[in-house]
């Protein structure tokens, strides 16, 4: 049953907690020789090729939480949260990137058209209007003489944790991969822990892969605390269901306040932010598996 958390029955392609709609890969590949192929080029953005009767289909199986943490997509649409954006990219097999946190409408408020050209997505977000979409955490510097995307990623505080990336280069920390991705404005993924070696297949490394199922899991720094339940922390009461979006809710008895113990890869007061600072991966054959 497609029941969103917190009640209110749902159904359909964007149903919270349900499976995303499947895309028939034969419709995406209009090649006479191999019409039914379902591969990395036809089933991207987190899609998984699955058998469907005679052929294969590209399934988008995203379990998205329903909290309203809106993001503005590069296509001009606002998404309920980042997971909804990723699911849409998979569903439509189009690249959609987050160009701004918050809705896409311009800053002149709600009501009667929201001050944007209806349906065009022309003025997606004022902050990015001159640069075009700045991807991979880059920001638009409109004051600069040569208007462009600038990267303000500071990797100075990260410890030595070398990784091999999809561009064939070794980086001293996953943060530097993000920085390179931001500067080059292209997708660079982490392939494995440790420096790249001669045995690494550079043709494979060079391939861009948006498949979330291969993406390494990440850990929130707060997960390194060795907190033990010593009578001070207890599970939160039922009325705080949903307080922690990606984590466990703990009720601190002494302060009578709730706090969140975030799952791997999330940070923020409600575990609502994605954090890519610390990486833990376990290589399994050629693919990376989540810890």
């Amino acid at each position: 049953s497609n029941q969103p958390p917190g009640g209110g029955g749902g159904s359909g392609g964007d149903c919270p907690g349900g499976k995303g709609k499947s895309i028939n890969c034969s419709e995406l590949n209009v090649r006479e020789s191999d019409v039914r192929v379902c591969d990395e080029s036809s089933c991207k953005y987190g899609g998984v090729c699955k058998e469907d009767g005679d052929g294969l289909k590209c399934a988008c199986q995203f379990q998205c939480h329903t909290n309203y943490i809106p993001v503005c997509g590069s296509n001009g649409d606002t998404y309920q949260n980042e997971c909804f954006l990723r699911r849409a990219a998979c569903k439509h097999q189009k690249e959609i990137t987050v160009i701004a946190r918050g809705p896409c409408y311009s800053d002149n408020g709600s009501g009667s058209g929201e001050g944007e050209e209806e349906g065009s997505g022309a003025e997606v977000h004022r902050k990015h209007s001159k640069c075009g979409p700045c991807k991979y955490k880059a920001e638009c510097d409109e004051d600069a003489e040569n208007v462009g995307c600038v990267c303000n990623i500071d990797c100075s505080g990260y410890s030595f944790n070398p990784v091999c990336a999809s561009d064939g280069s070794s980086y001293n920390n996953p943060c530097f991969v993000r920085e390179a991705s931001c500067i080059k404005q292209e997708q660079i993924d982490i392939r494995h822990l440790g420096h790249c070696t001669d045995t690494d297949d550079t043709s494979l490394l060079g391939k861009k892969d948006d498949g979330l199922q291969y993406r390494p899991d990440v850990k929130d720094a707060s997960d390194q605390r060795e907190d033990v339940y010593i009578g001070n922390h207890m599970p939160c009461p039922e009325n705080l269901n949903g307080y922690c979006i990606h984590g466990k809710c703990e009720f601190i008895y002494s302060t009578q306040k709730a706090s969140c113990r975030c799952e791997s890869g999330y940070t923020g007061q409600h575990c609502e932010k994605t954090d890519f600072s610390i990486l833990y991966v376990v290589p399994s054959r050629q693919k990376l598996t989540h810890v």
Partner: antibody
């Protein structure tokens, strides 16, 4: 100017059916999720149902689940609410409302609201 | 579901005075809260969204504040046209829920 105009309300017996319509104009209808919100006489507001802009996702309040069906025809810029197995407690003014933000949004504020159509369920 | 509780149920204020309306959520809704005004025989009208952002055309005397579970709508100097019922609504998660309303009446 965004306009929403409801129709289809009226008097119906318990167990009966009604179909409400909401004609929309002044905005790109298919880009916005649309909702029905009701208000019983002298009471507060209650969210009833929401449908995504494309129409492929629908959401219902527990009180109407299994009895009401929300749908839309984007070619006609029209939102519908099919109400079956009506109960006395369904008596209310039914408002059609647009979400404030366009896109793949499933929760939002309502802006603007239609004038409403009165549904009376009585024997 | 998230229960929204408004207080007081009725607020008696003289024109020109300040009115403070409260809305409490049973669990955190971040800043995902809206306020509506409904005058007798009229449809609800959006005043505030995002807990503190005024909607288009709403006078500056209306202001919203708060986040998490405690929210406030303040009308700095009540005008005759402000006497109405005010509702809060959370849109943080399903199902969308409204408060019971606060009626602002002439003292």
């Amino acid at each position: 100017e965004v306009q929403l105009l409801e129709s289809g309300g009226g008097l119906v017996q318990p167990g009966g059916s009604l179909r409400l319509s909401c004609a929309a104009s002044g905005f790109t209808f298919s880009s916005y999720a649309m909702s029905w919100v009701r208000q019983a006489p002298g009471k507060g507001l209650e969210w009833v149902s929401t449908i995504s802009g494309s129409g492929d996702s629908t959401y219902y309040a527990d009180s109407v689940k299994g009895r009401f069906t929300i749908s839309r025809d984007n070619s006609k810029n029209t939102l519908y609410l099919q109400m079956n197995s009506l109960r006395v407690e369904d008596t209310a003014i039914y408002y059609c409302a647009k979400f404030g933000v366009r896109g793949v949004i499933i929760t939002n504020w309502f802006d603007p609201w239609g004038q409403g159509t009165l549904v009376t369920v009585s024997s | 579901e998230i229960v929204m509780t408004q207080s007081p149920a009725t607020l008696s204020v003289s024109p020109g005075e300040r009115a403070t309306l409260s809305c409490r959520a049973s669990q955190s809704v971040s800043s995902n809260l809206a306020w509506y005004q409904q005058k007798p025989g009229q449809v609800p009208r959006l005043l505030i969204y995002g807990a503190s952002t005024r909607a288009t055309g709403i006078p500056a005397r209306f202001s919203g504040s708060g986040s998490g579970t405690e929210f406030t709508l303040t009308i700095s100097s009540l005008q005759s046209e402000d006497f109405a019922v005010y509702y809060c609504q959370q849109y943080n998660n399903w199902p969308l829920t409204f408060g019971g309303g606060t009626k602002v009446e002439i003292k």
